[in-house]
């Protein structure tokens, strides 16, 4: 039996199964009982990424430097431009419409994962035996100094923000 619905990459209009326009092209005119669908390529600054019946192509995304953005991948007639953030910044959202500076890890916290153009710094509290005395977007928690290996003794215990203070051993006379 003849189909009541059109096949893949087709659409039904005026009792005709018309071919969709391929990615990178927009619809100029629907097919008719005697003519095929007419499509035209998108212009340089535009794209369509699916088989479609759109009469207008989508504008490529603009990577606004004033928002900290730069082009990661130039758009084609079939793909949108991909933006990423300038060094030291990361995307505010998944759509990456603007950028914010990477977060620094406060004293007592170290960097677990360094930020990228799309993800912020991930901090972790310094566990016992480690410390961070700076606010940094790069520094990990550092281990306390080992006084013993220096033939010294702990004079002041370390914390998550400070290193231990070593001193000479008391000589019994």
């Amino acid at each position: 039996e003849p189909p009541t619905a059109c096949r893949e990459k087709q659409y039904l209009i005026n009792s005709q199964c018309c071919s969709l326009c391929q990615p990178g092209q927009k619809l100029v005119s629907d097919c008719t009982e005697f003519t095929e669908t007419e499509c035209l390529p998108c212009s340089e600054s535009e794209f369509l990424d699916t088989w479609n019946r759109e009469t207008r192509c989508h504008q490529h995304k603009y990577c606004d430097p004033n928002l900290g953005l730069r082009v990661q991948q130039k758009g084609t007639s079939e793909t949108d431009t991909i933006c990423t953030c300038e060094e030291g910044l990361h995307c505010m959202s998944e759509s990456c419409e603007s950028c914010v500076p990477h977060r620094s890890c406060l004293p007592g916290f170290g960097v677990k994962q360094i930020a990228t153009g799309v993800s912020d710094t991930i901090c972790e509290p310094c566990p016992v035996g480690f410390f961070s005395n700076v606010s940094s977007a790069f520094e990990k928690c550092r281990p306390w100094t080992s006084c013993e290996t220096k033939d010294l003794v702990v004079q002041q215990a370390g914390t998550n923000k400070t290193d231990v203070v070593c001193g000479p051993q008391d000589r019994q006379r």
Epitope: P2, P3, T32, E33, F34
Partner: antibody, heavy 119, light 108 residues
């Protein structure tokens, strides 16, 4: 059952005129585009003309443009082909044919009517 | 206009054999708007395949169509006695629609 019955063929002199008719039944005539296709004796098929379901648009082969006129009367379920300025090379069996549902192909054909152009 | 060239002109085969008919277009046939018809002597043509690969109603599955762009093929997997006839391809990409000159499949 779909039926297409052509009539109006016959012998005509070069330069003469003839009007072919195609009576349709067994389907909703006004929903379908229709066509005329011809076949010269011992030769292949040649698409002659087509008309949209509503009659709004008409199409012709270059060989008949300006001489032949396709038309339809949806109230009478009939397709026509007015042929003027006939030439010897128009001698052929003329078939009317309907479009298949949804697509541009011809699924039902009449048995044809013979047009002979000769002096 | 789009010119369709069919090959071979004549195909001599025995029942049970496979038949492969070719149809080549002078320019790309948009979106595979190509049909195949069978015609026997004294009869009107019969639609076999449309949009290059869709079988028309009531057509046995030994008939199959393939191809796109400028090259199309009609295959009859096992010839039955009733399949010996003339086969035409036809494009309906844009008017004027055109037919190939036909391929005659005859009994060897």
């Amino acid at each position: 059952e779909v039926q297409l019955l052509e009539s109006g063929g016959g012998l005509v002199q070069p330069g003469g005129s003839l009007r072919l008719s195609c009576a349709a039944s067994g389907f909703t005539f006004s929903d379908y585009a229709m066509n005329w296709v011809r076949q010269a004796p011992g030769k292949g098929l040649e698409w002659v003309s087509g008309i949209k379901s509503g009659g709004s648009s008409k199409y012709y082969a270059d060989s008949v443009k300006g001489r032949f006129t396709i038309s339809r009367d949806n109230s009478k379920n009939t397709l026509y082909l007015q042929m003027n300025s006939l030439r010897a090379e128009d001698t052929a069996v003329y078939y009317c044919a309907k479009h298949v549902d949804f697509y541009r192909a011809l699924d039902y054909w009449g048995q044809g009517t013979l047009v002979t152009v000769s002096s | 206009e789009i010119v369709l060239t069919q090959s071979p002109g004549t195909l001599s085969l025995s029942p049970g054999e496979r038949a492969t008919l070719s149809c080549r277009a002078s320019q790309s046939v948009k979106n595979s708007s190509l049909a195949w018809y069978q015609q026997k002597p004294g009869q009107a043509p019969r639609l076999l395949i449309y949009t290059a690969s869709s079988r028309a109603t009531g057509i046995p599955d030994r008939f199959s169509g393939s191809g796109s762009g400028t090259d199309f093929t009609l295959t009859i997997s096992r010839l039955e006695p009733e399949d010996f006839a003339v086969y035409y391809c036809q494009q309906s990409s844009a008017p004027p629609w055109t037919f190939g000159q036909g391929t005659k499949v005859e009994i060897k």
